[in-house]
């Protein structure tokens, strides 16, 4: 079946970085510059995508792939790709129309993306506060009162945080 | 393909006025938030402001509230930046960023970005 359709098609013998060039009797063409092929037998070499503004380029395109793009320190990428990017915020703050802003008390966000999360509710799983919350941080749950006899010193870490708006499984 | 070009960067006096502007085109300009981001001299990109695809909404960064406007004319595909009671610290480039889909209801990403327009406010 290949060679038959090499045969019929003499397109499908152009390799990735060439295209089938109707204008020079479909001979094999390197693509241009700034332009891909990454499959062969293609009819036209694809622009290579440029990483401006806030995106950087994190590879650059070549014959056979495209470029690569991430963002500029201050944003992370969002989407397939890396189609996006979104500012950073400081840990202890979520990104709001108004900007950013700091967790409302009783959230949390550990990281510079992201949502404020609620505290992890020791009570639920019979357990204590063993240190406190703060927007950087979860709370800590220690041992339940009851297993506070001598020598228990049993700390769990806490729960996963739940997102909001979710209820516990 | 799209493209957004920001003007009417200057030089401006502490106190002064400008008014930047962004014009879009090779896409629905009206079915997208945009945004204004600056950049001063050996900083980090910082966001500005950003309005809402029908202008409804508006929202600044805290230094500049009652001395930046930003408006936009759908009809034209521009975006406008109104800056009045210009500071030193104002002194930045410019830069018009379009929301990517989804913006406001799940994300705040961009994607795509204009060339810049320097500010320099100094007397």
């Known amino acids: 079946f290949e060679r038959t359709r090499s045969l019929q098609d003499p397109c499908s013998n152009c390799p990735a970085g060439t295209f089938c060039d109707n204008n020079r009797n479909q001979i094999c063409s390197p693509c241009p510059p700034n332009s891909f092929s990454s499959a062969g037998g293609q009819r036209t070499c694809d622009i290579c995508r440029q990483c401006k503004g806030v995106f950087r380029t994190r590879k650059e395109c070549s014959s056979t792939s495209n470029a690569e793009c991430d963002c500029t320190p201050g944003f992370h990428c969002l989407g397939a790709g890396c189609s996006m990017c979104e500012q950073d915020c400081k840990q202890g703050q979520e990104l709001t129309k108004k900007g950013c802003k700091d967790c409302c008390f009783g959230t949390f966000n550990d990281q510079k993306r992201g949502i404020c999360r609620p505290w992890t509710n020791c009570s639920l799983d019979g357990k204590s506060v063993l240190v406190n919350g703060t927007k950087e941080r979860d709370v800590v749950c220690g041992p339940s009162p009851a297993d506070l006899s001598p020598g228990a010193s049993s700390v769990t870490p806490p729960a996963p945080a739940r997102e909001p708006g979710h209820s516990p499984q | 393909e799209v493209q957004l070009v920001e003007s009417g960067g200057g030089l401006v006096q502490p106190g002064g006025s400008l008014r930047l502007s962004c014009a879009a085109s090779g896409f629905t300009f009206s079915s997208h938030w945009m945004t204004w981001f600056r950049q001063a001299p050996g900083k980090g990109l910082e966001w500005v402001a950003h309005i809402k695809e029908d202008g409804s909404e508006k929202y600044y960064v805290d230094s500049v509230k009652g001395r930046f406007t930003i408006s936009r004319d759908n009809a034209k595909n521009s975006l406008y930046l109104q800056m009045n009671s210009l500071r030193a610290e104002d002194t930045a480039v410019y830069y018009c960023?379009?929301?990517?889909?989804?913006?406001?209801?799940?994300?705040?990403?961009?994607?795509?970005w204009g060339q810049g327009t320097t500010v320099t406010v100094s007397s």
């Open positions: 960023a379009r929301g990517g889909e989804g913006y406001s209801d799940s994300h705040f990403g961009v994607d795509v």
